[in-house]
């Protein structure tokens, strides 16, 4: 009597990454009968939602439904109709919403409530929208890259999937940079994790992992820039801010109310004798770098060693995948090659920041000016964060791999989040059936 279409032998999952600056929808696909195998889930689509992050809809929540429409409709096109009702949808909001919640729990709840109602209107298996913790964001990013690199597989391969893949089972560390926060996650070498908040224990595929993670709220590239501006305007003699992190000839008017809108600038807030100020770029990498370092408090550390702001950081260990804005910024600056040393990166940043704004605009005519203007700051910030913040050195720089995608899937927390929520990463090593992995035969 039932004529419900037989499901394909594949399954799908949807994760929306509601970041501080924008929302992206990811569609994943995997063979139904190999759910517990490592490395079988892959991304089939990414849809970037037009507009800002969801936290910006706080005064216009009625627009959230329309905002999400195009990408949700794209999901309906990509995923076969017969699979829609069985396809889980998860939305995870990150630091932009963490900041909104700090300002007002009620407003954050209202935004999430409208997001939930909008997403539940689609014919998918909507599983909820929530603000994930910084610890989760770090952990899921670490799971994603190691899953995609095949680090959880007990089978050793005689070939390499990706150029930077070492043939051992040593996991990669994860470095994630967003607009409002940044995460560092890795397995330290025989080192006690001195602060319980930064310690994670996983048992994955029959192996135990003791993982260090920390998320630095307000140290994503956008919030770090707001912090720097708020810090620097304190000592400006008038409403002109001569800023070394912007190209010579660049000018932009900033509202003081916008500057102090974010909780990230509260520590620098003061009454200013003007409502607006003008940034005037002077394009000096060294001075920009120095200004950024003032955002990192390294004078206090209650542990054997710290990153900054009194946060414990064990000695760096092994290779690291640096993704999200670490990758996008360095890719734009053409600095993602494994062959580019830290000294060369610094040299190129000096040249880039010193280029006149008019010249930059001509060279990159297709790039939105808002983004284009901030690459000097962002590139300098990445160097400062990695070198002085996380204590990478010229030598250990070669262990940082700037990664956009691995095997066609974006590096980021979303895949790890879905793998966890769909119970696709078993604690124990599944019993493999003969010839189930054609690659290994």
């Amino acid at each position: 009597t039932q004529n419900k279409a037989l499901p394909e032998n594949v399954k799908y999952g949807i994760v929306l990454d509601a970041g501080s600056s924008h929302t992206s929808l990811y569609i994943y696909k995997w063979p139904a009968e190999k759910e517990n195998d490592t490395g079988v889930v892959h991304q089939v689509e990414e849809c970037r939602v037009k507009g800002p992050g969801i936290s910006k809809f706080v005064q216009k929540v009625n627009e959230i439904g329309i905002y999400l429409t195009d990408c949700m409709e794209r999901a309906r096109e990509v995923i076969p109709r017969s699979q829609h009702q069985e396809t889980p949808v998860y939305l995870g909001a990150t630091a932009g919403m963490r900041l909104l919640r700090m300002e007002s729990e009620e407003l954050a709840d209202r935004v999430l409530d409208v997001v939930e109602r909008s997403l539940s209107n689609y014919p998918f298996d909507f599983q909820g929208a929530r603000i994930i913790t910084g610890q989760e964001e770090g952990a899921y990013g670490w799971i994603t890259i190691n899953y995609l690199l095949g680090k959880f597989s007990q089978k050793t391969r005689w070939f390499s999937i990706v150029p930077y893949e070492t043939n051992n089972q040593e996991t990669f560390g994860a470095l994630d940079l967003g607009g409002a926060s940044t995460q560092v996650t890795f397995v330290p070498q025989n080192q006690t994790i001195e602060s319980p908040d930064n310690a994670l224990q996983f048992r994955l595929y029959g192996k135990d992992y003791n993982v260090y993670t920390h998320s630095f709220l307000c140290y994503g590239k956008d919030q770090a820039l707001w912090q720097k501006l708020a810090k620097d305007i304190q000592v400006a003699s008038n409403e002109i801010l001569r800023d070394p992190c912007f190209h010579p000839g660049y000018k932009k008017v900033v509202n003081v109310s916008d500057l102090y809108k974010t909780p990230c600038t509260k520590r620098f807030e003061m009454t200013l004798p003007f409502q607006q100020f003008e940034i005037q770029g002077i394009g000096n990498y060294q001075q920009c770098h120095q200004s950024i370092l003032e955002l990192f408090n390294t004078s206090y550390c209650p542990y054997s060693q710290c990153a900054f702001n009194g946060i414990f950081l064990p000695p760096l260990q092994g290779d690291f995948g640096a993704f999200s804005a670490f990758y996008f910024v360095m890719k734009f600056l053409n600095l993602t090659s494994e062959k580019v040393s830290q000294e060369k990166v610094t040299e190129m940043m000096k040249k880039f920041c010193a280029q006149p704004w008019e010249e930059i605009k001509t060279s990159y005519a297709g790039v939105k000016e808002k983004y284009l203007s901030e690459y000097c700051f962002s590139g300098t910030y990445i160097l400062s964060l990695l070198l002085q913040g996380y204590h990478f050195t010229a030598d250990s720089w070669e262990h940082i791999h700037f990664i956009g995608k691995i095997q066609g899937s974006d590096a980021g927390w979303t895949l790890g989040y879905m793998l966890n929520l769909t119970n696709m990463i078993p604690a124990e090593q599944p019993l493999s059936t003969p010839l189930s992995h054609s690659t290994y035969v």
Partner: antibody, heavy 121, light 107 residues
């Protein structure tokens, strides 16, 4: 045989309440989204409410005209779906059909015979 | 909400005629359009799903076409038992909405 059977209709005064029931047979009830659709000479066919599955946390959706007044619910152990109607208005008068979709979603390949609700003083 | 508009409201036919019933959506709904037949004193019955997909048990003289916002239900040789009201339905997004119907009657 796949079958839906509604009950609970009748005459009710404006502002009153009424609960409609629908019992399903011939298919695995707990696996399918259930709906109520009504029909009146004035408004024609009108979708009223939908309830999804346990795995969807029994998510519900309503037509704007009944939101806040009507509640759809289900009892998978009894193969029943219900429509609790409060603060009834004359414009709620009509034949109420229990419907489902055994094949995919958002169309109705199984309909009950309907139960008539009259809201009048 | 997506508004479904059907035309004509009434269609008088002779057995053996080929007829076309029209349905227009107020916005694009891809192929998420379904057709129903309702005979006097009966519940509606699904005729066509997803604009053109046939339903088992429905005579092959019924066919559907269209995509986006314009759709057509065709009956290639009308039989006397086809008398009734034909409704189209938006199955694209909530709220699900129906057209007002086309009444098919014999001349």
């Amino acid at each position: 045989e796949v079958k839906l059977e509604e009950s609970g209709g009748g005459l009710v005064q404006p502002g009153g309440s009424m609960k409609l029931s629908c019992v399903a047979s011939g298919f695995t009830f707990s696996k399918y989204w259930m709906n109520w659709v009504r029909q009146s000479p004035e408004k024609g066919l009108e979708w009223v409410a939908e309830i999804r599955l346990k795995s969807n946390k029994y998510g519900t959706h309503y037509a704007e005209s009944v939101k806040g007044r009507f509640t759809i619910s289900r009892d998978d152990s009894k193969n029943n779906v219900y429509l609790q109607m409060n603060n009834l208005r004359p414009e709620d008068t009509g034949i109420y059909y229990c419907t489902t979709q055994l094949d995919l979603y958002w169309f109705f390949d199984v309909w009950g015979a309907g139960t008539t609700v009259t809201v009048s003083s | 909400d997506i508004v479904m508009t059907q035309s004509p409201a009434i269609l008088s036919v002779t057995p053996g005629d080929r007829v076309s019933l029209s349905c227009r959506a107020s916005q694009s709904i891809s192929d998420y359009l379904h057709w129903y037949q309702q005979k006097s004193h009966e519940s509606p019955r699904l005729l066509i799903k997803y604009a053109s997909q046939s339903i088992s048990g429905i005579p092959s003289r019924f066919s559907g076409s269209g995509s986006g916002s314009n759709f057509t239900l065709s009956i290639n040789s009308v039989e006397p038992e086809d008398v009734g009201v034909y409704f189209c339905q938006n199955g694209h997004s909530l709220p699900l909405t129906f057209g007002a119907g086309t009444k098919l009657e014999l001349r």
